[in-house]
């Protein structure tokens, strides 16, 4: 059914009216407004921006807009005692020091409160020792070092290049390898696209540019001192020794000019293969230590950052639903930035602002959505998704009963090539149908649909004529809603061409050079890609909040469950003899998936035929759809990760950014041949198959006829 039928107001107020109200010029204006000064979490500037957004959302016409504050653990450099890394000679003299700040971009020389590059939540320390180059510091890189090259990182300072995986995973891997410090750097191979100039003349990373970021391993916990509960006025806080996810060794990020000085002296083993070489004019020797003439020189880190409990502020806006006010569709994105936030997050926040303005305009004309829409400007996302997680912890009982969907709205762009969507399978059909109705902004696709350009540029690896939609991982504010609470979630943004641009993220990510001018000059001068992202995000929210029957298709979940079961079975079948020895069978899982498929098919048939004029039956069917995602939640969580409770999806244990399917089984099987006690290891595989099969079967039964 079209959204026109959702409420008894004039057909004028439909999806088209909402989309037509969205204007690129407004997004541009909002982006400019949000990026003139830094908005670091926990600072006065970010509090002032919160109050500004609260005021403007009220003006736009929302029913209520409140600030929700929490006191969470944040991390800042010491202003009088800067962090740096040095090379010291045998006498302990510092013969080279890394830079203390990034050279400011043109026009920003006099801006105060630019936080220097640092790794948030690094402990203090001044370790010194030999350097070991560990490539991207992925699990497989440490396997290569330790198992194949027999290089021991214990007591060494490791240097790793940014990219491929979340930086927190790099630090965790280094800790497990026994390192006593970590240096993170941006290699031009990953952050300098060929044929493009560095900022301010292009969108590439200059040699003095540095990526900031947190290095936590929270696994969904939120504030490290109050896991599971909101960091409110009467919170009980853990001691720092018991805090969740804090690194135990000093960590610091540098740019590639400074990295060159460290890496050019490296001796020891040659890189194992070309995949360990970046683009600097250095040998990429692994070490340990410096070569010949420099062998007596060491590397010393000087880290003086402090962890501080600090107040943060979310802005929560409400547009009350006319028919089902107790059903919530949430659009949320963060407001805090490392510096100016030209892309991350303000390209997303500007889009949210324009979506709120458009909804407000419709509301002022007498329209209301069928369901309640909640708009959120999250704080402290950069410090571990803290604002969103604390708010969800505080409101978990409401959310688990009333939450229909969560749409994330961080950076609207990470490139300008094509659309990128990650979402629950329940939203596949919604995204397909919506993008078929939207115009493509891409050159060469004038008059064509967004669906068409997206499918052409980013085809599905499985289904011809369809676009790629990826699994949700983490590293953004949807995490608590999807992975912990089981609320159907999705995210959309414009992205780069992954085939031709092999760099990680976008080059200026989390640097001082992420400015308004970066976007306006190089990424999206007409703000047409921002507008398209606003249409996708806003259109999804509109449909989720307004359609009579929730726009979820449970059959798409059935399809992916079969695909994921096939994938995990094929991984297990690399160990045929152990499967036989320990009687490992996937029959229960495949049977559950088969049952799910059949029940989902029957449910979909009933969905076409039921009497939509009967409000009780309508509500019953919608509740079955809403609670399907919830049915994949295991209250006990995943092993050692209690806040990752979704049995079908979790962030990869090796890369927080990536999603893993059947993560419990996957982790039990990972590197199983290296487990000392095979009986125990395969016993855990069997237990995880049991949990997965039970969960899929239980979820299927929620779609059965109720009586």
């Amino acid at each position: 059914k079209s959204s026109n039928e959702a409420t008894n107001i004039t057909p004028k107020h439909n999806m088209k009216a909402f989309l037509d109200e969205l204007k690129a010029e407004n997004i541009k204006k909002f982006l400019y407004n949000f990026t003139q000064i830094p908005h670091l979490a926990g600072t006065e500037q970010n509090f002032q921006l919160a109050k500004q957004i609260q005021s403007q959302w009220k003006e736009f016409g929302l029913d209520s807009v409140e600030l929700a504050h929490y006191d969470v653990l944040l991390s800042y450099p010491n202003k009088t005692h800067p962090n740096y890394i040095s090379i010291i000679n045998e006498d302990g003299n510092e013969i080279f020091n890394t830079s203390l700040f990034e050279p400011p971009p043109p026009g920003y020389e006099n801006v105060s409160d630019i936080v220097p590059p640092f790794s948030a939540f690094s402990p203090q320390g001044m370790p010194e020792g030999d350097l070991v180059y560990v490539n991207y510091a992925r699990t497989e890189d440490f396997f290569k070092l330790e198992r194949d090259m027999k290089i021991n990182c214990s007591g060494k300072i490791v240097i790793a290049r940014y990219g491929k995986v979340f930086r927190g995973n790099k630090v965790k891997n280094a800790q497990l390898a026994g390192a006593k410090g970590v240096i993170l750097y941006s290699d031009p191979a990953d952050y300098f696209a060929p044929g493009v100039k560095s900022y301010p003349d292009g969108w590439n990373l200059p040699g003095g540019g540095v990526q900031r970021g947190n290095i936590l391993n929270l696994n969904g916990a939120g504030d490290p001192l109050t896991p599971g509960y909101p960091a409110n006025e009467y919170a009980y806080r853990r001691g720092i020794a018991e805090a969740v996810g804090l690194p135990s060794i000093p960590v610091h990020p540098i740019g590639y000019y400074d990295a060159q000085k460290l890496l050019e002296k490296m001796g020891g083993s040659a890189p194992p293969d070309s995949s360990w070489r970046g683009s600097l004019k250095v040998p990429y020797n692994v070490g340990p230590g410096f070569t010949g003439n420099f062998s007596t020189q060491k590397v010393k880190m000087h880290i003086h950052s402090t962890n501080e409990v600090t107040r943060i502020y979310n802005v929560i806006g409400t547009l009350r639903g006319a028919v089902e006010p107790d059903r919530y569709v949430i659009l949320g994105g963060h407001r805090d930035s490392w510096v100016f936030g030209g892309i991350d997050p303000q390209s997303g926040a500007a889009v949210v602002h324009e979506i709120v303005r458009s909804f407000g305009t419709l509301k002022k004309e007498g329209w209301r959505p069928r369901r309640t829409i909640l708009f959120a400007s999250w704080d402290a996302e950069e410090f571990g998704l803290l604002g969103s997680t604390e708010w969800a912890e505080e409101n978990s009982r409401l959310l688990q009963e009333r939450g229909v969907a969560y749409i994330n709205a961080d950076s609207s762009i990470e490139g300008n090539y094509t659309l990128r969507v990650d979402c629950t399978p329940l939203m596949y059909s919604l995204v397909h149908n919506l993008t078929k109705e939207l115009k493509s902004p891409d050159e060469g696709f004038e008059g064509k649909s967004l669906y068409e350009s997206w499918t052409k540029k980013s085809p599905s690896p499985e289904f011809s004529g369809m676009p790629r939609i990826s699994k949700l991982g983490s590293g953004n504010d949807f995490e608590v809603f999807f992975q912990r609470l089981g609320i159907a979630s999705g995210r959309a943004r414009y992205t780069k061409n992954w085939e031709t641009n092999k760099f990680s993220g976008y080059p200026l990510y989390h640097s001082v050079y992420e400015t308004y001018e970066l976007v306006e000059k190089f990424y999206d001068p007409m703000f047409k890609y921002h507008l398209t992202v606003a249409q996708v995000r806003g259109g999804m929210v509109f449909e989720l909040a307004n359609s009579i029957v929730l726009p979820f298709d449970c059959r798409d979940y059935a399809v992916v469950l079969r695909k994921y079961a096939d994938k995990i079975y094929s991984i297990s079948m690399k160990h045929p003899q152990e499967m036989k020895t320990y009687s490992v069978s996937f029959d229960s899982l495949f049977s559950a998936v088969k049952n799910f498929t059949e029940i989902a098919s029957k449910f979909s048939e009933r969905l076409q035929d039921f009497d939509k004029s009967n409000p009780i039956v309508l509500r019953m069917m919608n509740d079955q759809l809403m609670f399907l995602e919830r049915a994949f939640i295991d209250p006990l969580g995943l092993p050692d990760r209690p806040f990752y409770r979704h049995v079908i999806y979790a962030p990869s244990s090796h890369n927080k950014y990536a999603g893993e399917s059947f993560p419990g089984i996957y982790d039990a099987l990972f590197d199983i041949e290296s487990k000392v006690d095979p009986s125990k290891a395969w016993g855990e595989v069997k237990r995880q198959i049991y949990v997965a099969a039970f969960t899929v079967q239980a979820a299927a039964e929620t779609l059965s006829e109720v009586a």
Partner: antibody, heavy 116, light 107 residues
């Protein structure tokens, strides 16, 4: 269940050669690193050599005491690991055990006696 | 090479006793230490891995502890079948090395 059965031991003169075999069953042999460990009569355990799996390029490692004189190899199609021993010395006399990675499973051993 | 030094080299005990065997590594080996039991004429059997994890089928009277350089194997409520020689071993780095053994004899 995991089984490792060594064979090929015997009496050999100093300077001679011997090839030990270890037939594995009850596990997916090709996935696992394999070791040889020896024990002289009434003495302690001494690690001799290790061979890794194909995913680790069949990398080999040896104890200093045997380096250059022994070669560890494997045939994944036969689920067998070998220890080719050359230039044998009297101090190589021992029971030779085949073990799986981490020495969590051991064979019953095969006796090598080097004597003139 | 990392040297693993076990003590005592032998211990006399009675059924029901508690026996403690220590193993000292010459350098930090993390928790990459295992304990083995060997009876005359048979191959060693793994008891403990990762310094403190009991291998499948090993009775819970066997307990391992320690990290870095100092490790302990404790046998509580000694049983007749426990009289044997016990070895510690490290798999932290090459060459893998073992302690010289501790013989647990009947008093």
């Amino acid at each position: 269940e995991v089984q490792l059965v060594e064979s090929g031991g015997g009496l050999v003169q100093p300077g001679g050669s011997l090839k030990l075999s270890c037939a594995a069953s009850g596990f997916t042999f090709s996935n696992y690193w394999m070791n040889w460990v020896r024990q002289a009569s009434g003495k302690g355990l001494e690690w001799v050599a290790e061979i890794r799996s194909q995913s680790n390029n069949f990398a080999t490692h040896y104890a200093e005491s045997v380096k250059g004189r022994v070669i560890i190899s494997r045939d994944d199609s036969k689920n067998t690991v070998y220890l080719q021993m050359n230039s044998l010395r009297t101090e190589d006399t021992a029971v030779y055990y085949c073990t799986r990675r981490w020495n969590n499973f051991w064979g019953q051993g095969t006796t090598v006696t080097v004597s003139s | 090479n990392i040297v693993m030094t076990q003590s005592p080299s032998s211990v006399s005990a009675s059924v029901g006793d508690r026996v403690t065997i220590t193993c000292k590594a010459s350098e930090n080996v993390g928790t990459y230490v295992s304990w083995y039991q060997q009876k005359p004429g048979t191959a060693p059997k793994m008891l403990i891995y990762g310094a403190s994890n009991r291998f499948t089928g090993v009775p819970d009277r066997f307990t391992g502890s320690g990290s870095a350089t100092d490790f302990i194997l404790t046998i509580n409520n000694l049983q007749p079948e426990d009289f044997a020689t016990y070895y510690c071993g490290q798999s932290y780095t090459f060459p893998y090395t073992f302690g010289q053994g501790t013989k647990v004899e009947i008093k």
